[in-house]
């Protein structure tokens, strides 16, 4: 088992909004849960976009999940990752 490296980034979207993206990379096996939480509970699936789980060329995998949020509300969101029985949460950078 190779645990993922998880990285959260933010980028400008439309006025007043930002897109936050949570990327998991260099993990094996390919089975992974990556999702956003808002206020400590699950964020509805229809407001999240997931990338495919793809090989990254080193025998490991990568994927991502993104959502659009209001600027100033970053503190309400965390990215949750679960892989091979281990899990972690990752805040949006300020």
């Amino acid at each position: 088992t190779v645990p993922p490296m998880v990285n959260v980034t933010r980028s400008e979207a439309s006025e007043g909004n930002i897109t936050v993206t949570c990327r998991a990379s260099s993990f094996y096996p390919r089975n992974i849960t990556l999702t956003w939480r808002q206020d400590g509970v699950s964020l509805s699936h229809d407001t999240q976009q997931w990338g495919d789980v793809l090989p990254d060329g080193n025998g490991t995998y990568q994927t991502w999940v993104a959502t659009r949020i209001c600027r100033g509300e970053e503190q309400r969101f965390t990215c949750y990752m679960e892989h091979s029985g281990n899990h972690s949460t990752h805040p949006v950078p300020s």
């Epitope: 849960t33 206020d39 400590g40 509970v41 699950s42 509300e73 503190q75 309400r76 679960e82 029985g85 899990h87």
Partner: antibody, heavy 119, light 107 residues
Framework: DVQLQGSGPGLVKPSQSLSLTCSVT???????YYWNWIRQFPGNKLEWM?????????NYNPSLKNRISITRDTSKNQFFLKLSSVTTEDTATYYC???DGRGAWFAYWAQGTLVTVSA | DIQMTQSPASLSASVGETVTITCRAS??????LAWYQQKQGKSPQLLVY???TLADGVPSRFSGSGSGTQYSLKINSLQPEDFGNYYC?????????FGAGTKVEIK
Amino acid sequence: DVQLQGSGPGLVKPSQSLSLTCSVTGYSITNDYYWNWIRQFPGNKLEWMGFISFGGSNNYNPSLKNRISITRDTSKNQFFLKLSSVTTEDTATYYCARYDGRGAWFAYWAQGTLVTVSA
Amino acid sequence: DIQMTQSPASLSASVGETVTITCRASGNIHNYLAWYQQKQGKSPQLLVYDAITLADGVPSRFSGSGSGTQYSLKINSLQPEDFGNYYCQHFWSFPLTFGAGTKVEIK
């Protein structure tokens, strides 16, 4: 370390409003986290009532939505529960509790405040 | 709303025994589950979150497991201080709801 302490009257008359205070020490309620009220009925059933967040937003249990208000006084680092039009069914032990944005589990609880609704 | 159904409602076991408490959700809660212990006259104390992770300071004889709608809390080698009520709570969505509880008595 953070500590929560609930307080308020132990007896409320039917049709009146129940008002409780949660005083927080060791952490500013505006910095982070979700500041909740939970009650436990005789017989031990637990019910989440709602929260006020670090930013001042609320989320309430729909079963209480027309009767509940959770507010705060940031200068005193306190948050408050007001439950209107109470009946004997609102007799319970009331807890204030905190969770963080990683997940809505309650790692910090105050001691309970028993509130009896009776004429 | 997601309803949480706990079983058994009560159990009695001897010191050293292994006991298991189960919690069933009315919908898939994707491991968004916590367990609490409550002693008489005290506030609930967090034992487990995210279905499997022990909270700080919780003895390793406690363990959580499960997925989907079915979850369990296991206490290995039951100790006298483990008596009390145990509750599950989901945090998949609002409103947050708790199970009705399991009373654990020491024989």
